[in-house]
């Protein structure tokens, strides 16, 4: 039969494993031919059995409050036969109770605020602990409160957990206190469990301190190159108060030059000295200003602490900066007529060194083959200019200090090339004209137009004429439409393809410039074999494409 005693496991055993007891069959002679098995809820997880010996181990920490007993089943098998040696049997493992639940403060974290200098006896906060143990099980859940940390400023009532002030406190000496309260069960008897909680007690502030500058003199520097709005340094006052009571405002009390301002950084409570106007080392190299600081909020009843605002003196040194050359103008525009000879005067730029030493200036033109500049800033041409190639030049003129070639300034210079009438008008396109053999007199052969590359202040006006030779013996005539176009008309009836397959007509085109320019343009007219309706059937001529020649007179 089975051999075992009643099994008990104390709850909350901290070891990895606890030997509960041994199940064995009285048929087991120790030759290792029996195998013990454990079944049921908790087998293999909470309890294991050494299959070789029948020893039962608890491998988990047990909590009686969660489960007070385990009902398991035991089997023993003969390994050699695979048969049960004993009938499967049910057995109980009881979890024995201990005072294993310490008092717990369920509402933590605790935090309380009381005004500084509050009188003794002032109620701060009440803390309450609870104990999960059975209140009816002796004194397991009967609690007593005590103060572990916080004397002599605080006290706790042993049975209620009420914390009171027992000594006046000054926030400026210490602004918060950690009070540690212990709750013990078993009404503090031996074997009691305890729980602690921390209570953060903060002293609220009153505005009884004014801000005071850390320094009576601040020395700051500002570069003369600094733009307006630049922060040139910070000044700092300290206030023993906190929060709203320590918020402060900085201001200028004295600045004859009206050059500086002070703004308050409300996050850091610093005063930031700001440049209100640009400074110039050559004009004034140091300044002296006075600043003051006040609390932002002051209670009326505490005004006595804030009568005299703290002030400080700020000396500001202007740092000399080697400034680049300064041009008289931000940009220059010059004009010059096209076709003026090389070396012609365009204009003069001028830059000076703003620093005290007044370095001589050297000028240069960035990447220009057309213009030159000398050390006096005089710009001249290096080539004759053609407006029709470029009507504007965008130059970059650089001024460099002779004493410090790293000090450079550049400005744009725009040169406009003015027009002169140096181009004659010419055909606007290549014209290919045809006339039928059977054409009548006065038939329109071609409408022509002209272009002129010169700039026109007013509108261009072109005049069209046949050359003198063509006027005297021409088979064609021209009519000027007075709108910068003209038409070519036949001047006779009938043409002969065999005798004269091609006509070359010289057309003179003049402009309205001063002086007027004229060009001769050749119009090629092919004679075509046309049907009665006058439409072209075949145009036979030796050269299918003739380039139109023109020259300027």
């Amino acid at each position: 039969g089975w051999v075992w005693n009643q099994f008990f496991v104390p709850e909350e055993m901290n070891t990895t494993s606890h030997h509960v007891g041994r199940l064995r069959s009285d048929l087991d002679n120790g030759n290792n031919s029996f195998q013990y098995k454990l079944l049921g809820a908790g087998a293999g997880s909470t309890f294991i059995i050494d299959e070789r010996t029948g020893d039962i181990y608890a491998i988990e920490k047990l909590d009686r409050e969660e489960r007070s007993l385990y009902i398991l089943r035991a089997q023993v098998i003969d390994i050699t036969t695979g048969r049960a040696v004993e009938p499967e049997s049910e057995f109980v493992i009881k979890v024995s109770d201990i005072n294993d639940n310490e008092p717990k403060f369920l509402d933590e974290p605790y935090e309380a605020i009381v005004p500084e200098m509050s009188p003794e006896g002032t109620l701060v906060i009440q803390v309450t602990a609870s104990d999960a143990d059975d209140p009816s099980s002796g004194n397991n859940a009967r609690l007593l409160y005590s103060l572990l940390q916080g004397q002599p400023y605080f006290s706790v009532e042993p049975t209620t957990g009420v914390i009171r002030i027992s000594s006046k406190m000054d926030r400026e000496l210490q602004d918060e206190y950690w009070v540690i309260i212990q709750a013990k069960d078993m009404i503090g008897q031996p074997g009691a469990l305890s729980g602690t909680t921390s209570v953060l007690i903060k002293l609220s502030d009153v505005n009884d301190n004014k801000p005071i500058f850390k320094e009576s003199l601040y020395r700051l520097t500002v570069s003369e190159s600094a733009p307006t709005g630049t922060s040139i340094g910070t000044i700092m006052a300290y206030d023993n108060d906190i929060g709203e009571n320590a918020e402060m405002d900085y201001s200028i009390e004295e600045d004859d030059s009206q050059t500086f301002d002070i703004i308050t950084n409300h996050e850091t409570q610093e005063g930031i000295v700001i440049l209100k106007k640009k400074v110039n080392f050559e004009h004034q190299n140091h300044y002296g200003i006075r600043a003051k600081v006040k609390n932002h909020h002051v209670d009326k009843q505490l005004m006595k602490y804030h009568t005299e605002a703290s002030t400080t003196f700020i000396k500001i040194q202007v740092e000399d900066v080697d400034e680049p050359p300064l041009f008289l103008l931000p940009y220059y525009i010059f004009e010059i007529f096209e076709e003026t000879p090389q070396g012609s005067f365009v204009g003069v730029v001028s830059a000076t060194d703003p620093d005290n030493r007044k370095s001589p200036i050297r000028y240069s033109i960035t990447r220009s083959k057309v213009f030159n500049i000398d050390d006096n800033g005089t710009i001249t041409t290096t080539n004759s200019l053609d407006r029709e190639i470029s009507a504007w030049y965008n130059l970059s003129i650089t001024a460099t200090e002779k004493y410090n070639i790293e000090q450079i300034s550049s400005i744009p210079v725009y040169v406009q090339v003015l027009n002169i009438n140096d181009h004659a008008p010419e055909f606007s396109q290549y014209y290919e004209s045809y006339v039928c053999e059977n054409a009548g007199s006065g038939q329109v052969i071609q409408t022509i137009s002209a272009v002129d590359r010169d700039e026109s202040i007013e509108e261009h006006h072109f005049y069209f004429n046949l050359s003198v030779e063509d006027t005297n013996s021409s088979s064609f005539t021209i009519i000027d439409n007075q709108d910068n176009t003209a038409v070519i008309l036949t001047n006779r009836t009938g043409f002969n393809l065999q005798e004269e397959p091609i006509f070359y007509i010289s057309i003179l085109i003049a402009d309205n410039g001063i002086p007027s320019l004229t060009s001769t343009n050749t119009l090629t007219i092919h004679v075509c074999d046309c049907d009665d309706s006058g439409s072209t059937q075949t145009c036979q001529y030796q050269e299918l494409m003739l380039s139109m020649g023109f020259k300027t007179e």
Partner: antibody, heavy 120, light 111 residues
Framework: QVQLVQSGAEVKKPGASVKVSCKVS????????IHWVRQAPGQGLEWMGI????????SYAQKFQGRVTMTRDTSTSTVFMELSSLRSEDTAVYYC?????????????WGQGTLVTVSS | QSALTQPPSATGTPGQRVTISCSGS????????VNWYKQLPGTAPKVLIY???QRPSGVPDRFSGSKSGTSASLAISGLQSEDESDYYC???????????FGGGTKLTVLG
């Protein structure tokens, strides 16, 4: 009955490797851990490591980490322990032992031991 | 240097009671079961006591084990000549994550 039978004695040169086998019978091979323990001449017992035959997971003593490898062959119910980079101080009797179903349960059966001599 | 400390030797006369101590630390004996092994010369060790105080079948009740804190002890009462052997304590060590043995105690039975 439960038996753990180990391979025969070995003589090895320093720097060489040795592989000792442990063939088990009389129980389900995968049900119990196998530990390896060695004993230098005239010295005490020293645990080397453990293998779980069901999962091939191993745990080695820090001292042997990197030098020892434990393997198993389920078809022959045999566990192997290989020790490499042998030195003279590895001369010892090497035992395999059966442990319980938890790491911390005692060793109830031991092999007869294998003497490994490391000598140049 | 063994993790568990045993006296290297112990002596007794037949019928006498002898105790062998084994001391360790909180990571081994302090938090795990102690086992005792007996080893006769030229043979493999055999389990004598497991789980602090449990005897396997076949081990006479003259042998008993106990544990207190970080120390354990093996007591042999009614000493007999066949008890002359080497005795080793062993336990699992949580820090080393492995088994540790004592250096062994050679028990001599006089007389």
């Amino acid at each position: 009955q439960v038996q753990l039978v180990q391979s025969g004695a070995e003589v090895k040169k320093p720097g060489a490797s040795v592989k000792v086998s442990c063939k088990v019978s009389g129980y389900t091979f995968t049900s119990y851990f196998i530990h390896w323990v060695r004993q230098a001449p005239g010295q005490g017992l020293e645990w080397m490591g453990i293998i779980n035959p069901i999962s091939v997971s191993t745990s080695y003593a820090q001292k042997f980490q990197g030098r020892v490898t434990m393997t198993r062959d389920t078809s022959t119910s045999t566990v192997f322990m290989e020790l490499s980079s042998l030195r003279s101080e590895d001369t010892a009797v090497y035992y395999c032992a059966r442990g319980g179903i938890q790491l911390w349960l005692h060793f109830d059966y031991w092999g007869q031991g294998t003497l490994v001599t490391v000598s140049s | 240097q063994s993790a568990l400390t045993q006296p290297p030797s112990a002596t007794g006369t037949p019928g006498q009671r002898v105790t062998i101590s084994c001391s360790g630390s909180s990571s081994n004996i302090g938090s795990n079961f102690v086992n005792w092994y007996k080893q006769l010369p030229g043979t493999a060790p055999k389990v004598l006591i497991y789980t602090n105080n449990q005897r396997p079948s076949g081990v006479p009740d003259r042998f008993s084990g106990s544990k207190s804190g970080t120390s354990a002890s093996l007591a042999i009462s009614g000493l007999q000549s066949e008890d002359e052997s080497d005795y080793y304590c062993a336990t699992w060590d949580d820090s080393l994550n492995g088994w540790v043995f004592g250096g062994g105690t050679k028990l001599t039975v006089l007389g």
